[in-house]
């Protein structure tokens, strides 16, 4: 009898270790998406950035989906969202048409069920980039903790997309699940 | 028999509580390192910052190692990495060599097994710090989610290190483990 | 006997699932507070911002308390703290008193037991907001990993509060618990 109980206990321990490990991993979706510069739109108006890498270099995704330029939530939860956006201009890349620039990022959430789009976070700066200087650079970082539901979509909008720095260490956004919804 | 089983159950519960608590803590390395201003290099070129506090004021470290100016990963996992770098200049510190500055931070990862160094995140701004103003200040913040392997090293490079703000609330970097690698 | 043991095992599994789920949720306090612009102080000096939303729009709080303009820790632990502060000015809002601005944020921790206040994180920039431009904008983001004890209070101080952007996506701060204290 006692031996049988110990066997059961071992089963409990074993299955629990598996369950705990498995559920922990499955409960923690994440994504880190880096800019795909082969398809950056021109213009100076606010545009949605739709081309991102999800599986090369630093880019990665797990238990979330990247589709049509949007990061799709597959699992309800509270997530920490972040974005780092770098803008740069070198005089060899053409003459700036204006010195007064609004360099901005907007992290937006779209709900498919109730078609609506809302800005979760924004950041940026107005800049005076004079033609007297051969190189200009500016980075924005935003981050925050948000409740996301399965099916909701996260996307990035920027002004002046043609000034984006195309490096994977410069222009990226991401998310990781921190906890369940009560 | 029934009493014996209950005792076994209590053991299961007890050991599980210990195991869960212990494994949870051990699975979560972290570090928050603050600038050690007694040894900041001069110059305006990009340099690696090697002097950081890990055990005074806000600085702390657990299940990671700080050695030779680098934060060493002891445990495979996905980590959130961050850095906050502040630059400042007061006219009492003397005239700036140039009014056009590139104030930058680079968070780099070095793999010892395959000797190589890569930039994970960068941020900053070109600035025009005119002599007309007696005080100048600028801060950069970067953050992102990265897969780190045991033995890999995180370091911080900045331009214009002589302009760094030496306060612990100003210039720091850190990491915390979010989840295991599948 | 064997049937009885299986019932006990089911109980162990069941109670463990409840316990694990419950303790996980309870172990993870969080807050995301957005600016309440109905009561922003004027002036250009450093002031503590006391009016924040905790339960509308993106604002939310769990297992932490918001009281008297401060975010109060209810549970010991290591927390990731963050703040995003946006400043803006449009010429239609009147002329700026000075073109040289110091736009800063300070995230402070106050301990009630040992009455003291310390800055955990700071960020910002000196800016030249010329009258030649009709619109100016600037955002600051800071974040870091800190040990917080029950009863300690987090608050936000800024310079030039009258220039704050009152949008919930622009000016906010927050915290989420990452792990227990050993």
């Amino acid at each position: 009898g006692s031996q049988h109980i110990r066997a059961e206990k071992a089963m409990v321990d074993g299955s629990w270790l598996d369950l705990a490990k498995r559920s922990k991993l499955e409960a923690q979706p994440f994504a880190h998406l880096t800019i795909n510069a082969t398809d950056i739109p021109s213009g100076s108006h606010k545009v949605s950035l739709s081309s991102w890498y999800h599986d090369r270099g630093w880019a990665k995704i797990s238990n979330m989906t990247f589709s049509n330029g949007k990061l799709i939530v597959n699992q309800d939860g509270f997530y920490y969202l972040y974005a780092n956006i770098c803008f740069r201009h070198h005089e060899t890349s053409g003459d700036l048409a204006t010195e007064y620039l609004q360099l901005m990022v907007y992290v937006t959430k779209t709900s498919i069920k109730i078609p609506s789009s809302h800005t979760l976070m924004k950041g940026g700066s107005t800049k005076y980039w004079s033609g007297n200087s051969e190189f200009h650079f500016y980075s924005i970082n935003v981050g925050g903790f948000f409740k996301l539901r399965s099916g909701e979509e996260i996307s990035i909008e920027v002004s002046n997309p043609s000034l984006l720095d195309p490096d994977q260490d410069a222009t990226y956004f991401g998310a990781f699940k921190v906890r369940d919804i009560d | 028999g029934s009493q014996h089983i209950r005792a076994e159950k209590a053991m299961v519960d007890g050991s599980w509580l210990d195991l869960a608590k212990r494994s949870k803590l051990e699975a979560q390395p972290f570090a928050h390192l603050t600038i050690n201003a007694t040894d900041i290099p001069s110059g305006s070129h990009k340099v690696s910052l090697s002097s950081w506090y890990h055990d005074r004021g806000w600085a702390k470290i657990s299940n990671m190692t700080f050695s030779n100016g680098k934060l060493i990963v002891n445990q495979d996992g996905f980590y959130y990495l961050y850095a906050n770098i502040c630059f400042r200049h007061h006219e009492t510190s003397g005239d700036l060599a140039t009014e056009y500055l590139q104030l930058m931070v680079y968070v780099t990862k070095t793999s010892i097994k395959i000797p190589s160094s890569h930039t994970l995140m960068k941020g900053g701004s070109t600035k025009y710090w005119s002599g007309n103003s007696e005080f100048h200040f600028y801060s950069i913040n970067v953050g992102g989610f990265f897969k780190l392997r045991s033995g890999e090293e995180i370091s911080i490079e900045v331009s214009n290190p002589s302009l760094l703000d030496p306060d612990q609330d100003a210039t720091y970097f850190g990491a915390f483990k979010v989840r295991d690698i599948d | 006997g064997s049937q009885h043991i299986r019932a006990e095992k089911a109980m162990v599994d069941g109670s463990w699932l409840d316990l694990a789920k419950r303790s996980k949720l309870e172990a993870q306090p969080f807050a995301h507070l957005t600016i309440n612009a109905t009561d922003i102080p004027s002036g250009s000096h450093k002031v503590s911002l006391s009016s924040w939303y905790h339960d509308r729009g993106w604002a939310k709080i769990s297992n932490m308390t918001f009281s008297n303009g401060k975010l109060i820790v209810n549970q010991d632990g290591f927390y990731y703290l963050y703040a995003n502060i946006c400043f803006r000015h449009h010429e239609t809002s009147g002329d700026l008193a000075t073109e040289y601005l110091q736009l800063m944020v300070y995230v402070t921790k106050t301990s009630i037991k040992i009455p003291s206040s310390h800055t955990l994180m700071k960020g910002g920039s000196t800016k030249y907001w010329s009258g030649n431009s009709e619109f100016h904008f600037y955002s600051i983001n800071v974040g870091g990993f800190f040990k917080l004890r029950s009863g300690e209070e987090i608050s936000i101080e800024v310079s030039n509060p009258s220039l704050l952007d009152p949008d919930q996506d622009a000016t906010y701060f927050g915290a989420f618990k990452v792990r227990d204290i050993d």
Epitope: S42, T92, D95, L96, A97, Y100, S130, G131, S162 | - | -
Partner: antibody, heavy 122, light 108 residues
Framework: EVQLLESGGGLVQPGGSLRLSCAAS????????MSWVRQAPGKGLEWVSG????????YYADSVKGRFTISRDNSKNTLYLQMNSLRAEDTAVYYC???????????????WGQGTLVTVSS | EIVLTQSPGTLSLSPGERATLSCRAS???????LAWYQQKPGQAPRLLIY???SRATGIPDRFSGSGSGTDFTLTISRLEPEDFAVFYC?????????FGQGTKVEIK
């Protein structure tokens, strides 16, 4: 309708100076970058100089840098090109042209003025 | 600077025929930042295409642009009598902005 009308061209000796003007109408002049483009007789087009809407930044082709100065008076809706130390190879029809202002860098030219002929000869 | 080479130098065609003009860059043109102009004798150039393939306002749809990187093409699907002129390409992805030497489309 957008209109650009150049004036100030003529015959000048090598080493001499000339100031071209371009009167603009039909659009908010101060909001748009402007450029000068030239065309030597029987040859192709060459961009000469550009200026931002505010006039705060100016750009020049290497062939004219240090000799030509572009400027604008937004209160008069007029673009200028001051040409000093003129050379025979500067002989061309000079067109003023509006930038579309839709991109962050100076881009294409639309529309163009009818041009003014500058002849540098002794 | 980016050098643009247009070919052929001269294209002799009849009205109703298709014209294909080439513009090759010495290095990749960033962001497809290329424009095409038409210039008739004694007149100022007129914008036809920008962004490599976007037609300017009022330009007939028989004019079309294509290409990216270093190779760009202007196509006139059916030549009309008023289309005979000199055509120039221009890049604006790099400083300084540069033009091709031109392709003359003449009546055969």
């Amino acid at each position: 309708e957008v209109q650009l009308l150049e004036s100030g061209g003529g015959l000048v000796q090598p080493g001499g100076s000339l100031r071209l003007s371009c009167a603009a109408s039909g659009f908010t002049f101060s909001a748009y970058p402007m450029s000068w483009v030239r065309q030597a007789p029987g040859k192709g087009l060459e961009w000469v100089s550009g200026i931002t809407g505010s006039g705060g930044s100016t750009y020049y082709a290497d062939s004219v840098k240090g000799r030509f100065t572009i400027s604008r008076d937004n209160s008069k809706n007029t673009l200028y090109l001051q040409m000093n130390s003129l050379r025979a190879e500067d002989t061309a029809v000079y067109y003023c042209a509006k930038d579309p202002g839709t991109t962050v860098i100076m881009s294409w030219f639309d529309p163009w003025g009818q041009g003014t002929l500058v002849t540098v000869s002794s | 600077e980016i050098v643009l080479t247009q070919s052929p130098g001269t294209l002799s065609l009849s009205p109703g025929e298709r014209a294909t003009l080439s513009c090759r860059a010495s290095q990749s043109v960033r962001g497809r930042y290329l424009a095409w102009y038409q210039q008739k004798p004694g007149q100022a150039p007129r914008l036809l295409i920008y962004g490599a393939s976007s037609r300017a306002t009022g330009i007939p749809d028989r004019f079309s642009g294509s290409g990216s990187g270093t190779d760009f093409t202007l196509t006139i699907s059916r030549l009309e009598p008023e289309d005979f002129a000199v055509f120039y390409c221009q890049q604006y992805g790099s400083s300084p902005r540069t033009f091709g030497q031109g392709t003359k489309v003449e009546i055969k």
